[in-house]
Amino acid sequence: EEELQMIQPEKLLLVTVGKTATLHCTVTSLLPVGPVLWFRGVGPGRELIYNQKEGHFPRVTTVSDLTKRNNMDFSIRISSITPADVGTYYCVKFRKGSPENVEFKSGPGTEMALGAKPSAPVVLGPAARTTPEHTVSFTCESHGFSPRDITLKWFKNGNELSDFQTNVDPTGQSVAYSIRSTARVVLDPWDVRSQVICEVAHVTLQGDPLRGTANLSEAIRVPPTLEVTQQPMRVGNQVNVTCQVRKFYPQSLQLTWSENGNVCQRETASTLTENKDGTYNWTSWFLVNISDQRDDVVLTCQVKHDGQLAVSKRLALEVTVHQKDQSSDATP
């Protein structure tokens, strides 16, 4: 005859408020004859949690049909968990006796503790934009979780980052904990379309981590490159000069033309295009009237990008004598 074992496989069961907890208990023998009861705690003050045969336990259901002849599974489910339910639960075998049943063997117990899910991670980037090749810091925060053990990872475009520091508070015992992590990210010129992801894994999430994201587009400033060129062909007595502003981000841009130091107020044609990497190109055309012009016309294309100091490119206009002669003969 096999000696009865009471098997409670989980030492610790983490449950969240409002959910249902399943407490497992199996026996290895049908003998001796008698019921299996569930208690919370030990000793004379222990609380009866479930007795199949008698007592009112509206929150408790059995996993198996206890009336089946060879049933060896005495697992129970407790619904609508509250903080008052924490404690150690024991399944206990009784031997039928007179006048009272006699306790025969107890399981090792399962401690039920409250687990609280972490809040969705919130990722915050730097207050000001930074140019490529520089390092920026991102912070990630999540709150309200329990137990304290938690894993946080950082990713940039799916690649795990290693340069970060993480703190979990408080250090002592608490009902709930918070995590804060700061990651240092080196910006690349193509990072306009990049994302940083903060991933939090916790036992209450059952293998489905929470993620918070931030777009590097909020943190990066890609300064433009400027090129001013003169078109070889002229239109009547006008020469077309082009200012190409390339690979800048964000879109915020002011462009002004100056002719020999005098800012020109007249309208100019321009186009804005977006590159595959998320940066922008801006092309502005400026028509210079070359009739009666001296030879030393200097055009300046000045660009103020995202509130930064203005950058400019100059072009000394090349107007040949032949061009001047032609222009004086040309009809408007």
């Epitope: 609380e47 199949q52 008698e54 007592g55």
Partner: antibody, heavy 114, light 108 residues
């Protein structure tokens, strides 16, 4: 729906015996103890005993030992209470109660009278 | 056997009044095994409070239960006309199981 349907009014003579029935529906009778409770007119409640229909094992209050006999028939989901050597003291309403304590039968009124 | 003594045997209360019924056990009863029933004339008793302090389904929240060891109580925070009934405490901590003698609660 859980129900406990008890047998009707019984009027019996002193010294006789009577067998009251309680038929369960909406649950497996073997899953719970069945209790019997006595209530005399305008009086309190007295616990007579309980039976485990699964194996017939029963417990009685000392006062009802020898007076009451509980049995159960799982095939018909019925619990029985037999009362013997009836006297006027046995005149009362008898309730059957499921072991979870929230379901009671409607009661059987027993009158012992010559 | 454990004897449960309820007091008072009869009492009346005005609507809105706070009411406390007591149940005293001759020896210690585990709180898991102390129940209360409400009974109105012509009806079967209804489970009212289980495991000392848990309200059965449908019981108004003005009812509460407390106690431990040998001293238990049922409290109505604000008496209502429909609360007029008999209340019985019940222990199933040890055989033989026993009921208290009951408290008949009337409305003034």
């Amino acid at each position: 729906e859980v129900q406990l349907q008890q047998s009707g009014v019984e009027v019996v003579q002193p010294g006789a015996s009577v067998k009251l029935s309680c038929t369960a529906s909406g649950f497996n009778i073997e899953a719970y103890y069945m209790h019997w409770v006595k209530q005399r007119t305008e009086q309190g409640l007295e616990w007579i005993g309980r039976i485990d229909p699964e194996d017939g094992e029963s417990k009685y209050a000392p006062k009802f030992q020898g007076k009451a006999t509980m049995t159960a028939d799982t095939s018909s989901s019925t619990a029985y209470l037999q009362l013997s050597s009836l006297t006027s003291d046995d005149t009362a309403v008898y309730y059957c109660v499921r072991g979870s304590y929230e379901y009671w039968g409607q009661g059987t009124t027993l009158t012992v009278s010559s | 056997q454990i004897v449960l003594t309820q007091s008072p045997a009869i009492m009346s209360a005005s609507p809105g009044e706070k009411v406390t019924l007591t149940c005293s056990a001759s020896s210690s009863v585990s709180s898991s095994y102390l129940y209360w029933y409400q009974q109105k004339p012509g009806s079967s008793p209804k489970l009212w409070i289980y495991s000392t302090s848990n309200l059965a389904s449908g019981v108004p929240p003005r009812f509460s239960g407390s106690g431990s060891g040998t001293s238990y109580s049922l409290t109505i925070s604000s008496m209502q006309a429909e609360d007029a009934a008999s209340y019985f405490c019940y222990q199933w901590s040890s055989y033989p199981y026993t009921f208290g003698g009951g408290t008949k609660l009337e409305i003034k």
